[in-house]
Each structure stands twice: as C-alpha cells, then as structure tokens.
Amino acid sequence: RQQWELQGDRRCQSQLERANLRPCEQHLMQKIQRDEDSYGRDPYSPSQDPYSPSQDPDRRDPYSPSPYDRRGAGSSQHQERCCNELNEFENNQRCMCEALQQIMENQSDRLQGRQQEQQFKRELRNLPQQCGLRAPQRCDLEVESGGRDRY
C-alpha cells in the first residue's frame, strides 16, 4: 500500500490509543438504561412478584433510581466529554469509524438482548451527528463472536 496510507494507519492507531472513549460508553449505556427504565422492554412476571401491583408486566417503574440520577447532569457531562474525544477524529472518517467500532467492541458483551444491541448500534451511529461532526459513510459495527465473556 501507499506510504501515506501506512502513515495514516499509524496516525489513527496513535489517536485511538490516546483517546479516552469511556465517556462515550457511559453516555450510550446510560441512554439505553434510561429507556429500559422508562419503557420497560423487560417482562417481569406478576405471578412471581408478590410486591408488584396489578399492572402491565411489560411496564417498568420509571421512578426507579438510576446510578446517574444522583450525579446531577451526568449524562450531558458524559456526552460533552465524549464529543470532545470524537472531535479528534473529525478529519479522518476511517479513524472515526474505528473509534466507533472500538466502543461497540468494548460494550458488546454488556448487551445480551437483540433490542439492547440494536439500540446501542443506532445510538452509536448517531453519536458523531449528535456531536455536530460528520458521521462515517460506511462503518460496520458488527462484532465477531467472542470465545469467552469479556469484561
């Protein structure tokens, strides 16, 4: 391959190593968890739950505390820090895609349901635009099957 491509790869690699993508992971997982709490895709069997009032079993308690509720504007804080990190990839679409792939890879074993995984991918694809950045045109967020439970 051309010399400049190799240099570009190396530059992207060092950018990825320098970047702290944790705020992005936190922001996205928070969104998914908030939606779980509010819209309740998790059926909870009323017959098993002596505490549960007679209610739609697919409904979850929207007032259940989230680990972030007590941290004030935790979510927007994470998003802001996430956007600052992604901004570093603004001029390299392929590298932006690799950053998104890394986020997906890091969180894939946290997402054990089809809906959760699909929503995470959807939110992840929208992340650059939410940050006012250009989104990569083609970016494959599929994760290879893992042999063991990563953490």
Partner: antibody
Framework: VQLVESGGGVVQPGGSLRLSCAAS????????MHWVRQAPGKGLEWVAF????????YYVDSVKGRFTVSRDNSKSTLYLQMNSLRAEDTAVYYC???????????WGRGTLVTVSS | DIVMTQSPLSLPVTPGEPASISCRSS???????????LDWYLQKPGQSPQLLIY???NRASGVPDRFSGSGSGTDFTLNITRVEAEDVGVYYC????????FGQGTKVDIK
C-alpha cells in the same frame, strides 16, 4: 409471562438427561437465557448462558465439556443437555431470562434433577 | 473467577426494624461504562428467586421502596428500612461483570 422447565428426574451417575424450558409471554428470540441450579439446602449457582442469536455460549467450569446449552427460537424453547452426570449435579435447575443487560428478571419454577445410583 | 462473599449468613430481624446485608467481591464490579454489575435477589421459602436490585442501586419493577442498594467497586449493601414479615427468605448478591457468580446467601427470618 412465564418459563416452564421440564425433563428433570432420577438418573444414574454417568447418565444423561435433557432439560427443556418453554417460554411464553415475551419475545423469546430477543433475549439471552440462562440455566441456574440450586443443590438441596444450598445456594444458587449459575450454570450456563446462551445469547439470543446463539453467538456466544458460556458455562461454569464444573460443567464444561459435559453440559450443552441450546435453543430453538421457532419453538421458544431453551435446552440443557447434561451428559456424564455426577452426584454433585443433583439440584433444582432453573430456567432464567436475561434482561438484555445481564441481570436476571424472570425465573421459572425449576425442575429437580437427582443423580443417584 | 470473581468470588462473592456475603455477611452475615444469618440475620434474625424484628418487624419494623431496619436490616442490612453486606456483599463483597474479590475484584471491582465497576465497568468502564460506569455501571456496577451487582444485583440482589430474594428467594422466599418454597419459591423461585426474584430480582430486587440491579446495577447496584436500581430497584426492580414492583419492589417496595423500603429496599435499597448502595455501594461501588467491591463493597455493596442491601438495606431494608423497615422489615416486614413478607421479607423473610434468602437474599443473594450476584456479580454480572465477568460471567455470573452468586454470593452464599443470607437467611433473613423473624426473631
């Protein structure tokens, strides 16, 4: 919304048994599923997990190579094939639904497996 | 493997009084996504277990607000502000960070 286990019974050491779990009231194919067991008078032990798309399967060390978890999404059924059974496998086996975010939000009533000569 | 240790293993309680159960993990359960992968389950006599708390502090649907979970990293606590007779049973903590592992269980009964 329920999980109903079946297939338990008495089996001799070294024997085999296949447990089934019929799911209803939710979209089975969208969720990871687990098997958790409880020996008589003892605590809970996680046994096996299968992802919604079967991409990943995980097992506790003590059953690796002997137990196989599988699922048939068209029948909304989870299976646990247990081979080379040992006395220490005697337990109530629960079928459990993963919330999608790794916590367990629906449990079956359990089926008793007794390994004894 | 992550080892979960609960204390006490037996807890006699008086209805109306508070109670708390401790759970310690052999390594931190705080993931890079900011969540603690620690859940609490209650198994009432003759019943299947049921979810009480997930992600360390989130109360499951239908669980009364007298139950709360706290802690981060390796040390977690389940609190019951005022114990009721229906709260008796065995309480288990479970880590879901790396595979899944339960604590030994804490038997709560009325004094």
């Amino acid at each position: 919304v329920q999980l109903v286990e079946s297939g338990g019974g008495v089996v001799q050491p070294g024997g085999s048994l296949r447990l089934s779990c019929a799911a209803s009231g939710f979209t089975f194919r969208d969720y990871g599923m687990h098997w958790v067991r409880q020996a008589p008078g003892k605590g809970l032990e996680w046994v096996a997990f299968i992802r919604y798309d079967e991409r990943n399967k995980y097992y506790v060390d003590s059953v690796k190579g002997r137990f196989t978890v599988s699922r048939d999404n068209s029948k909304s059924t989870l299976y646990l094939q247990m081979n080379s059974l040992r006395a220490e496998d005697t337990a109530v086996y629960y079928c459990v639904k993963d919330s999608g975010l790794r916590y367990f939000n629906l449990w079956g009533r359990g089926t008793l497996v007794t390994v004894s000569s | 493997d992550i080892v979960m240790t609960q204390s006490p293993l037996s807890l006699p309680v008086t209805p109306g009084e508070p109670a708390s159960i401790s759970c310690r993990s052999s390594q931190s359960l705080l993931h890079s996504n900011g969540y603690n992968y620690l859940d609490w389950y209650l198994q009432k006599p003759g019943q299947s277990p049921q979810l009480l708390i997930y992600f360390g502090s989130n109360r499951a649907s239908g669980v009364p607000d007298r139950f709360s979970g706290s802690g981060s990293g390796t040390d977690f606590t389940l609190n019951i502000t005022r114990v009721e007779a229906e709260d008796v049973g065995v309480y288990y903590c479970m880590q879901a960070l790396q595979s899944w592992t339960f604590g030994q269980g804490t038997k709560v009964d009325i004094k």
